[in-house]
Amino acid sequence: LIIGFGISGRHSITVTTVASAGNIGEDGILSCTFEPDIKLSDIVIQWLKEGVIGLVHEFKEGKDELSEQDEMFRGRTAVFADQVIVGNASLRLKNVQLTDAGTYKCYIITSKGKGNANLEYKTGAFSMPEVNVDYNASSETLRCEAPRWFPQPTVVWASQVDQGANFSEVSNTSFELNSENVTMKVVSVLYNVTINNTYSCMIENDIAKATGDIKVTESEIKRRSHLQLLNSKAS
């Protein structure tokens, strides 16, 4: 969490941003809140990006003002206009690109004063893994697949019964480039698995960590997946 104070001495307002990550090709949110004002027409929101000459987005006098918007953000940004009055200056970003990564500044002016806070935005690709029993294999084998990752992640297998065991000798991981030539499909195979055990396939890069669990017993198979973004800290 980054909390920024106003830059005009005693006329300062608190602006709060949260570092976040965007998934390439999907929509992202750059989060920013501020001390609200009672009049929408008195609120100015400016989003800026380090190294970019034009604005990312500007909202003032109750409407968007995009004449100074940088070309790379054209048609891709929107504030939640109905939530500005309650102090929400968050920005919606359409179709996140790798090049959207960087340092953003949320700059606010109200009748109470000015304030700003920076936000680190990471971009990459991350997706839920799915673990299945591979019945085509000669021995009991598990197959962990996740459709979209970037940068290339690490894949580690673990099991509830053999805690701390190193499965690198009995697993094989491959990365297949997807059609857009950026993200990759992750496939990891674990051999010689035993029943009545829970196995976890953990995929991680510097943006996200995802886990796919599978519990195989004589009578049933249970699956569970979990994804968590890393380094989501507020300013």
């Epitope: 090709g25 968007d64 048609g75």
Partner: antibody
Framework: QIQLKESGPGLVQPSQSLSITCTVS????????VHWVRQSPGKGLEWLGV???????DYNSAFISRLSISKDNSKSQVFFKMNSLQADDTAIYYC?????????????WGQGTLVTVSA | IIVMTQSPKSMSMSVGERITLNCKAS??????VSWYQQKPEQSPKLLIY???NRYTGVPDHFTGSGSATDFTLTISSVQAEDLADYHC?????????FGSGTKLEIK
């Protein structure tokens, strides 16, 4: 309320150019992009291009060599020019505005101007 | 170029019937699909944006759903005034593209 209105020539000679003006009211051209879409007789809709608030343009690659879109913010007017028209460019030409600043759907359309390409 | 394929090309329905119009994108377009109704001699009217959001003033018997490549527009109980062409379009990537339309006729 928000309105867009196209004004065009109606008839264009083959190989000549087409100029249409879209005059908007109820919103500012510095807040929203304006798109151009056409519909040939009995056919579907075809997106031609857009001019954004900052003056940047994006064109359908099939028309990029003969299409130009510009605007005058102070007059709330957008100008569409297409060169080298042929018979298959006969269509109703619309200007349209998106629902938000992110292009999610064209909520506002002009009434359209029918352009016939014929000698 | 993303191709939007609409089906069926036309359909004839009785008042009160439930119908589903389909739109398939040739590649992932997220939820950036909108649906339009166009009556004879009129401009298209936005019904649904963002795949499932009903536009202001659109009757609630129109419902949109879907994501990625498969989208549907459902009319839960067809009214006589629903006689029109219906178009889907994607605004995910350039060039923005539309389907060829579905003509709805009332029996």
């Amino acid at each position: 309320q928000i309105q867009l209105k196209e004004s065009g020539p109606g008839l264009v000679q083959p190989s000549q150019s087409l100029s249409i003006t879209c005059t908007v009211s109820g919103f500012s051209l510095t807040s929203y992009g304006v798109h151009w879409v056409r519909q040939s007789p009995g056919k579907g809709l075809e997106w031609l291009g857009v001019i954004w608030s900052g003056g940047y343009t994006d064109y359908n690659s099939a028309f990029i060599s003969r299409l130009s879109i510009s605007k005058d913010n102070s007059k709330s007017q957008v100008f569409f020019k297409m060169n080298s028209l042929q018979a298959d460019d006969t269509a109703i030409y619309y200007c349209a505005r998106d629902i938000t600043t992110i292009v999610e759907g064209f909520a506002y359309w002009g009434q359209g101007t029918l352009v016939t390409v014929s000698a | 170029i993303i191709v939007m394929t609409q089906s069926p090309k036309s359909m004839s329905m009785s008042v009160g019937e439930r119908i589903t119009l389909n739109c398939k994108a040739s590649e992932n377009v997220g939820t950036y699909v909108s649906w339009y109704q166009q009556k004879p001699e009129q401009s298209p009217k936005l019904l649904i944006y963002g795949a499932s959001n009903r536009y202001t003033g659109v009757p609630d018997h129109f419902t949109g759903s879907g994501s990625a490549t498969d989208f549907t527009l459902t009319i839960s109980s067809v009214q006589a005034e629903d006689l029109a062409d219906y178009h889907c379009g994607q605004t995910y990537s350039y060039p923005f593209t539309f389907g060829s339309g579905t003509k709805l006729e009332i029996k």
